[in-house]
Structure formats: structure tokens, C-alpha cells
Interface confidence: low
């Protein structure tokens, strides 16, 4: 007898995982034109496409990228100057420095003379031409050739005090999410960049301990909740003529530069008007400034008839970040997401006053991002389709017409393979291509943009097909259950030979923060996955209220008491979880990563006994030890008069005597920039002063992404065992 | 401009070898996925392999086991090593870039393959 | 793997006529097929890609169309140059990628 085909495929290993053996690509084009692209190819050649003319060769090959270690390029607008970036050096999440080469096309040489300092922060060409804006040392340089000596435009550089260009830590982190503050206008006449003084800002610092006798220490301006906050200013600089009035400064919001406030965003809309975005400290009103320039003046004039107020009455403004506007061709009119009478975010069109908008798109969904608006297209994504919350699919309005008609691009193109896209369009949307993430292999395809119809694929993961051919995957469901009124979409992953009849342990995976969304239709192979599929533990995700994109009700229901509700719907749903008679009561776990690892060490602590055993890594412990602009988005401030006692009673410390009828596993990095050790410090201090016994891991020198490959290593293989201990599941 | 130029064909007895070459110009080879198709006398075209940028490689069935895909980067140079050669595999063989990994977009002259004793 | 039917086997016409061909696929292949033309003694040469996109140097005599199942090529008006065989290729599912059986346009 042979033996069937079925028994030849082997479960996961946690080595796979690991070794990323099963991770997929995607293929983004470095649009360079309307038809013509860039893409560094595997043998890390850059190459050169031209989709109409099919037309492809190497612009730069893989030799000169070596002969200086580059790893990352940038060609100027004028196609005659290639940026090479090597030396990466991390900072934070977005930041990062590095070493820059100028490589001449037509000569076939690199730039000799007045070489870019090293390292840099922040550089970038100017969107026509060949000029060069980057920052070194927290100050903006400016280079009308890459051959010609630099301009420098701002003097006020202070490491750790004064940021020019680039964002200081918050601002990278719970702002911008970019490691650049500095834009140039279309025709590259103008460039705008931000200031923050971080002068008056608490320093968080913490040991680095290398391999030196003695540990370095990193101080980070770092505003917690409550604290001193950057103050920001903008400034346009003329680049055509810097040296003549030098940098202007752009006036902020009366109704906002009346308190604490923030900077959220610009947007060139033409050469000369630009389009800045304001935030009250208290984060419920956003205002938004058309602003232009007066060439008898020499000045950036932000008329108050051009102030677009934006305000919550049920919690924040916008959704993780306030939405950035998608102007028209008119320069004047642009279209937005925001919320709408219903609390669902949706595409709306301002015309003169927010207050006159003509709501663009509605219903029981929500409108996620807009990606092109063109003369008579405009291309957005949303969840509508079938409504799972937890879909993309690009839509295009035809703008033309009235009524605006509309088409989903990618509803039906793979419909089981391909449920969560995102694109990429060329520059008036002539062709873009769409990055499917799932929850089938992710594909990547290139279309065109007047019909969209499909030109080619890009990469379609046939290797990886290949290599999963022989794997045992676990199913993986997506489903929702109803509690008093309550729609909770889940996600399950089952085991590879799932019998409904036996019973299983159960590990819930939680994130939980706000605006996030754990239950999404996306491929994955990753540590659950593994678990699900050799250790035949049943994993599963649920988004709780506070998750995203299922409307403001949802959203906001957490609003200034974080750490309450998302909690509960964990427990309810792990509750109905139990009903459904698969799941093995005695082995209920609950694990998860920074706002995961608060909200699984207060569902561990709810003294419900429905966890055996749980793991917090990285987790908050109190919302006053994180960044201010994310803390007090959602909680308010941790005053007397505001919201102090909710911050006080949220903290993972109150509930310390609970945790003991529980396995804990407490894990964090001692180099968190972002939650500080301290959380975890504070957490272990509050057990052992309870004389609660529990089980901990740091990691040396490590950030809140335990991500170097030997850590990750070590913290993966550490967490398999501590469940297969918590589940009797025998090694 | 792209240009492809195969060599190596010839007479070879059932179960001998031969090596084919393709040798490119205009384009380097290393970066785009290269196929090999070959076309029996008086009959219609199939596919027989190819390899990817990454240098994956790929085979129909009728030549998996028996011929080799490779390329010499430094020589812009695509190989098809071919290894108990049968009767049926007699063919002119041609060697073709792919656009991604889709159709075949430039071709060579093709080179002569007779399997006979 | 994707069968590719090429009809009719041979078509007969005369120059300046209007020549349709078609190619069936034994199961849904979205737009992803191009057609080659082969003239003898010659490489085959991309005339079609993505069912309806005519390549570079390609006259515009020469027009796909279809979607799915059913392909078409069409030369609107026969010249003496293009009496040659017509393949088509598809290359949705591969490996393999597979061609039809071709149809040879031929002088009547």
C-alpha cells in the first residue's frame, strides 16, 4: 500500500519560523514616471522599466552597489544622479543614519568634490532636477548640484535639543511615522521643514551595556504622559535663492497656538500653496491650514477663511493619526476621510467649509485610505466588501460623472487568494500595482489604470508555493460571535487535523490597542501558526472595542478608560470560545506584545480563572510611564482635574495579588526606546511585593523589538516551552 | 539593442549529452528570468525550462531529471545541459528572455538538437 | 495543466482580407496570454501580450481581445508578410507554461 498523499507533508517547525523559511515577497514599483519604474532586482542590480515600451535594462548595477556596500538608492528627477545609501545605522523605528554616494549616470563615475558629510540623517532630491536637502547633525543643508558646495539653511542643530528636519522620538513615533520632518514643493522651488525644540523635555535614560567595562547610558527626550512636549515650528526656505530672506516661518492657528498643540502633517498642494496640519494637545480638534505665498511679501499668508476645523464629540480626532488631505486638480477642493454623522469614517469632499462637505462615500464600513485623486478618478480602500471588517479592497470613484460611480478594482480578481491589497500608483495613476497580502500567498500585479485590467504579475511567490507544498497548515477561520449587542470578529487557527469531537488547548493572541486590528485576511506563517500546526494548540484573535475601522461607537468605547473593555471582550470571547466544545478548559492561555502584553497581564489578573498561564512581553504597565502624544490621545491627561484616577487604576501594579492563581511570564528588552523597562520593572516590584511567584526574561541590550536574530532566537524558543510546560505538552 | 544567439546543437545518439549555450547582449541575463523552448520538425512549441533572476529553476516534466538550467553571470550566458537524450527530445531548441516571469519577449535564432543512431 | 485550443488548424485567405483566430483555454486564465508569430526558418515573435496589448514594433493590424476561456486575435487586413504559423501562450498557472497548437494563416 502506498501512503497517502496527505501523510508525506510535515508539521511547522519552530526552526521554520526562525529561519523565515516560509516568508513571502511583494513587489512595490520606485514609480519614476507615468509608465517608467525602478526595481532592484534580486542579484541587486537597479533596473529600469518601461511598461509601455517594455523596454528594461540595468540603470545601475549590482557592482558599483557593492564597490561602497550600498543597500539602498535614489535617482534624481533629471535621471542624471543616482543617490547610493550605505552604512545603515538604526536609530528608532523610522530613523536611521547613514553613508551617501553620489554616482554621476552620464559619467559612470561617482561625484568627486565637496563629498556629503557622514553620517547623515535625512537626505532626499528635490522633485524636479537634481537638487540635494539633507540633514547632518540635526541641521538642513541644501545643494543646488550634487557637485557644488552645500548651503547650509538652518543653524540650530542641537543633539538631543533641537531637531531641524527630522522628527525628534514622539514625533517620529506617535506623529509623523517618518524619519523625515522636511518637504520639497513640486517644482522644487520651495522647501518646507520642521523645527522641534526638545530643550524642556524630561529625559528618559537607560543603561546600554555592550561589551565595555563600564555600560554607556542613552538619554532620549522623551515626554511621558503630562510632561513638557516639543514645540514645533514650520518654515519654508526659497531653495532657487536661499541666502536672500532665508527661512519663513509658517504662522500656526489662532484657535490652536492658543495651548499646547502639535504639528500633524504637510501637504504641497501647488508650487506656492501648501497645506499644514495643526492638533490641540487635548487631541478632539484638528484644524487644517491652506496657506500661500506672497511674492511681494515674501511671505506664507494662511488666510483664516482657509481653516478647516475638524472636532470629535465622542473621543480623538481621526483614527490612530488624523487623515492628510488629497487635494483636486482646482488646488483648492480636497477630498477626506473623516467621521460621518454616523461615527463611520468615510471619503468626504470640502469645497469651501467642512461644514458644507458632500459626503463622498457611506455606509456601515469604513473608507481606510485615499491613494489617487486624479482629474477624474479617485482611488480609496475600504473594508465594505461582504463586510469583514478586516478586508482592503481599492475602489475607484469616477469623479467625472454625477452621480460619482463607483468600482471595486479587486473585489473579484482572486477573490479566495487575494482579500487585503494595498497599491501603488505612478504619478497620475496611469498604471499602479496591487500588493495582495492575502489571506491566500500574497501576489503583487501591475495594472492598468485607465481600465484595470491586469498588465503583468510582478511576483506571485511561486517559490514559496513551492516549498509549503509538503507543509501541514493549520485553517484558518475568520468568523464573529455576538454578545449583548456586540459583533466581535475573530480570527481561528485550528490545528492541521482539527476534529470539532477532542478537545484542545487554547493560546488567545492579543493586541487590543486602539485603532488596531489583530483580524485581519492576511497571509501568515509565524510563531502561532507553528504552534497550531505541531503542537496542535488552537490559537485565536479577537478585536475587542477600541479596534478599528467597525465604526466610532466601536472605537470609541474606550475612550479615557483604557485597559477596561479590551479586557472584557477578550474574556467574553474565550468564554464563547469554551461553548463552542472543542476547547480544553483546563488550558486556556492568553500572550501578547507591548499594548498586547498590558492588555494579557490584566486579563490574567481579571480573576476570572480562565488562564492557566499567559506571557507579557515588552508590555505597558501604566499609561503614565508612555509617550504623551499616544497616552493622552486616549486617556486624557493624568491630572487631578482630568483623568489621574483612571490612570492610577488602569496600571497593571493595582492588580499584582491577582496574578497569583496564574503562570506569568514577564519578558522585556533593557534598550526599550519605546515602553521602558521600567513598565516591566515596576511590574516585577509590584509581584514580589505581593509575594506573588513568576517567572521573568529580560533581554540584554535589546529594543521593543527583541529583533536582533539571536534574541528572538532564544525569546521564541523560551515562550514554546513555558506553554508546552503550561499545556503538559511533552517536548 | 537585446539580441540572443544559441550554440551547441548538433547529431547525438539516444542517451548521449549536449550541451546548449545562449549567449546574450543588450541586457544583462542576471537580472531577468530566461526560458528554454524547443519546437519538434513541423510541429508546434514547448516549453522545456527556465530560471529566474534568483536562479530558481524550473522544467517540464517530459525533461525534469534528465536536463539542467543554469547561467554564468560573467558571461551573460545561458546553459541547458542535456542528459540522456532521447529521440523525441530532437527539436530545434530556443532560448528566450521572459518579461517577468510571463511570455517571452525576445528570442534566438534557435539551434538544431537531432537524437538519432 | 492549462490546455491551450488553437482554431482553425490552417486558414486559408487572401491578402487584404481579415483573419480571426482563436485560441480556448481549458479553464480561466484572467487576460494572461500572449500570441507569437513564427514564420518559417524563424524565431517565433511577440506580437501580444496580455490578451489586447500589441508589443513594441507590432503594426496596428494586429489586435487581441478576450478575457477568461476565449481569445482572440485578429489582423484586420492581410499583408504578404504576415502568412506565418500563430501561437498562442498562456502563463497564468506555470510551471508549465503552455502553447496552443498553433494556426497557420496561409495564402488561398
Known amino acids: 500500500l502506498r501512503p497517502s498523499r496527505g501523510n508525506t507533508k510535515r508539521a511547522l517547525t519552530l526552526k521554520d519560523i526562525l529561519n523565515g523559511t516560509f516568508s513571502y515577497k511583494t513587489y512595490f514599483p520606485n514609480w519614476i514616471s507615468e509608465q517608467e519604474y525602478l526595481h532592484q532586482s534580486e542579484d541587486d542590480n537597479i533596473v529600469f522599466y518601461n511598461i509601455e515600451t517594455r523596454e528594461s535594462y540595468i540603470i545601475l548595477s549590482n557592482s558599483t552597489m557593492k564597490s561602497v556596500n550600498a543597500t539602498d538608492y535614489g535617482l534624481s528627477p533629471d535621471r542624471q544622479f543616482v543617490y547610493l545609501e550605505s552604512d545603515y545605522s538604526k536609530l528608532w523605528r523610522y530613523s536611521y543614519t547613514a553613508t551617501y554616494y553620489i554616482y554621476d549616470l552620464q559619467n559612470g563615475e561617482f561625484v568627486r568634490g565637496y563629498e556629503l558629510p557622514r553620517p547623515i540623517q535625512y537626505l532626499c532630491w528635490s522633485p524636479v532636477g537634481s537638487k540635494l536637502a539633507y540633514v547632518y547633525q540635526n541641521n538642513i543643508y541644501l545643494k543646488q548640484r550634487p557637485g557644488d558646495p552645500p548651503f547650509q539653511i538652518t543653524y540650530t542643530g542641537r543633539e538631543n535639543r533641537i531637531f531641524n528636519g527630522i522628527p525628534d522620538w514622539v514625533y517620529e513615533e506617535e506623529m509623523l511615522a517618518t524619519k523625515y520632518a522636511l518637504w520639497w514643493s513640486p517644482d522644487g522651488k520651495f522647501l518646507a521643514y520642521v523645527e522641534f525644540n526638545d530643550s524642556d523635555i524630561p529625559i528618559i535614560a537607560y543603561s546600554y551595556y555592550g561589551d565595555g567595562q563600564y555600560p554607556r547610558t542613552i538619554n532620549i527626550p522623551y515626554p511621558k504622559a503630562g510632561a513638557k512636549n516639543p514645540v514645533v515650528r514650520v518654515f519654508i526656505v526659497d531653495t532657487t535663492y536661499p541666502h536672500h530672506v532665508g527661512p519663513m516661518e509658517v504662522p500656526v492657528p489662532e484657535m490652536i497656538a492658543s495651548s499646547d498643540y502639535y504639528f500633524s502633517w504637510l501637504t504641497w498642494v501647488s508650487s506656492e500653496r501648501v497645506c499644514l496640519q495643526w492638533l490641540k494637545r487635548v487631541q478632539n480638534v484638528s484644524v487644517l491650514s491652506i496657506c500661500d505665498f506672497r511674492e511681494d511679501w515674501h511671505a506664507w499668508e494662511c488666510p483664516k477663511n482657509q481653516e478647516h476645523v475638524e472636532e470629535s464629540r465622542t473621543g480623538w480626532a481621526g483614527g490612530f493619526f488624523v487623515s492628510t488631505p488629497a487635494f483636486s486638480q482646482d488646488a483648492t477642493s480636497y477630498y477626506k476621510i473623516f467621521s460621518d454623522k454616523d461615527g463611520y469614517k468615510h471619503i468626504h469632499y470640502i469645497k469651501d467649509t467642512v461644514e458644507n462637505a458632500i459626503q463622498i462615500t457611506s455606509g456601515k464600513w469604513e473608507a481606510i485610505y485615499i491613494f489617487r485623486v486624479t482629474q477624474d478618478s479617485l482611488f480609496y480602500s475600504s473594508n465594505e466588501f461582504e463586510g469583514y471588517p478586516g478586508r482592503r479592497n481599492i475602489y475607484r470613484i469616477s469623479i467625472g460623472n454625477s452621480p460619482p460611480s463607483k468600482k471595486c478594482v479587486t473585489c473579484h480578481l482572486r477573490k479566495e487568494r487575494c482579500q487585503y491589497y494595498t497599491a501603488s500608483f505612478s504619478y497620475k495613476a496611469k498604471y499602479y500595482a496591487l500588493v495582495c497580502y492575502g489571506p491566500g500567498l500574497p501576489i503583487s500585479t501591475l495594472h492598468d489604470g485607465r481600465t484595470d485590467q491586469e498588465i503583468q504579475v510582478l511576483e506571485e511567490n511561486k517559490e514559496l508555493e513551492n516549498s509549503l507544498r509538503n507543509i501541514q497548515l493549520p485553517k484558518v477561520e475568520i468568523k464573529k460571535l455576538k454578545d449583548g449587542g456586540l459583533t466581535f470578529w475573530y480570527k481561528m487557527i485550528l490545528p492541521p487535523q482539527f476534529d470539532r469531537s477532542k478537545k484542545y488547548p487554547l493560546l488567545i493572541q492579543v493586541y487590543g490597542g486602539p485603532c488596531s486590528q489583530s483580524v485581519k485576511s492576511v497571509f501568515a506563517v509565524n510563531w502561532i501558526t507553528y504552534l497550531a500546526s505541531k503542537e496542535g494548540i488552537v490559537i485565536a484573535l479577537v478585536d475587542g472595542r477600541g479596534t478599528a475601522f467597525q465604526g466610532d461607537k466601536f472605537l470609541h468605547a474606550v475612550y479615557r478608560k483604557l485597559g477596561v473593555y479590551e479586557v472584557e471582550d477578550q474574556l467574553t470571547a474565550v468564554r464563547k470560545f469554551i461553548e463552542m466544545g472543542f476547547i480544553d478548559e483546563e488550558r486556556i492561555a492568553i500572550w501578547g506584545w507591548s499594548y498586547g502584553g498590558y492588555v494579557s497581564s490584566l486579563a490574567l489578573a481579571s480573576g476570572t480563572g480562565l488562564f492557566k498561564c499567559g506571557i507579557a512581553v515588552a508590555p505597558v504597565s501604566s499609561w503614565e510611564y508612555y509617550a504623551s502624544i499616544y497616552s493622552e490621545r486616549f486617556m486624557g491627561l493624568p491630572t487631578k482635574d482630568d483623568n489621574l484616577e483612571h490612570y492610577k487604576n488602569s496600571t497593571v501594579m493595582a492588580r499584582a495579588e491577582y496574578f497569583r492563581n496564574v503562570d506569568y511570564l514577564l519578558i522585556h528588552g533593557t534598550a526599550d526606546d519605546n515602553v521602558h523597562f521600567q513598565n516591566s520593572a515596576q511590574i516585577a516590584k509590584a509581584l514580589v511585593n505581593a509575594q506573588v511567584d513568576f517567572q521573568a526574561m529580560w533581554y540584554s541590550d535589546q529594543n521593543h523589538g527583541i529583533s536582533s536574530g539571536r534574541s528572538q532566537n532564544h525569546l521564541y524558543t523560551h515562550m514554546t516551552h513555558f506553554l508546552k510546560q503550561c499545556f503538559s505538552l511533552s517536548d | 539593442d537585446v539580441q540572443l544567439v544559441e550554440s551547441g546543437g548538433g547529431l547525438v545518439q539516444p542517451g548521449g549529452s549536449l550541451r546548449l549555450s545562449c549567449a546574450a547582449s543588450?541586457?544583462?541575463?542576471?537580472?531577468?528570468?530566461m526560458t528554454w523552448v524547443r519546437q519538434a520538425p513541423g510541429e508546434g512549441l514547448e516549453w522545456v525550462s527556465g530560471?529566474?533572476?534568483?536562479?530558481?529553476?524550473y522544467y517540464a516534466d517530459s525533461v525534469k531529471g534528465r536536463f539542467t538550467v543554469s547561467r554564468d553571470n560573467s558571461k551573460n550566458t545561458l546553459y541547458l545541459q542535456m542528459n540522456s537524450l532521447r529521440a523525441e527530445d530532437t527539436a530545434i531548441y530556443y532560448c528566450?528572455?521572459?518579461?517577468?516571469?510571463?511570455?517571452?519577449?525576445?528570442w534566438g535564432l534557435g539551434t538544431l538538437v537531432t537524437v538519432s543512431s | 495543466e492549462i490546455v491551450l485550443t488553437q482554431s482553425p488548424g490552417t486558414l486559408s485567405l487572401s491578402p487584404g482580407e481579415r483573419a480571426t483566430l482563436s485560441c480556448r483555454a481549458s479553464?480561466?486564465?484572467?487576460?494572461?496570454l500572449a500570441w507569437y508569430q513564427q514564420k518559417p526558418g524563424q524565431a517565433p515573435r511577440l506580437l501580444i501580450f496580455?490578451?489586447?496589448n500589441r508589443a513594441t514594433g507590432i503594426p496596428d493590424r494586429f489586435s487581441g481581445s478576450g478575457s477568461g476561456t476565449e481569445f482572440t486575435l485578429t489582423i484586420s487586413s492581410l499583408e504578404p508578410e504576415d502568412f506565418a504559423v500563430y501561437y498562442c501562450?498562456?502563463?497564468?498557472?506555470?510551471?508549465?507554461?503552455?502553447f496552443g497548437g498553433g494556426t497557420k494563416v496561409e495564402i488561398k
Open positions: 496580455s490578451a489586447s
Open positions: 501562450q498562456q502563463y497564468y498557472d506555470w510551471p508549465p507554461y503552455t
Open positions: 528566450a528572455k521572459t518579461w517577468g516571469t510571463e511570455y517571452f519577449d525576445y
Open positions: 479553464q480561466p486564465i484572467n487576460n494572461y
Open positions: 530560471i529566474r533572476g534568483s536562479g530558481t529553476t
Open positions: 543588450g541586457f544583462s541575463m542576471s537580472n531577468f528570468a
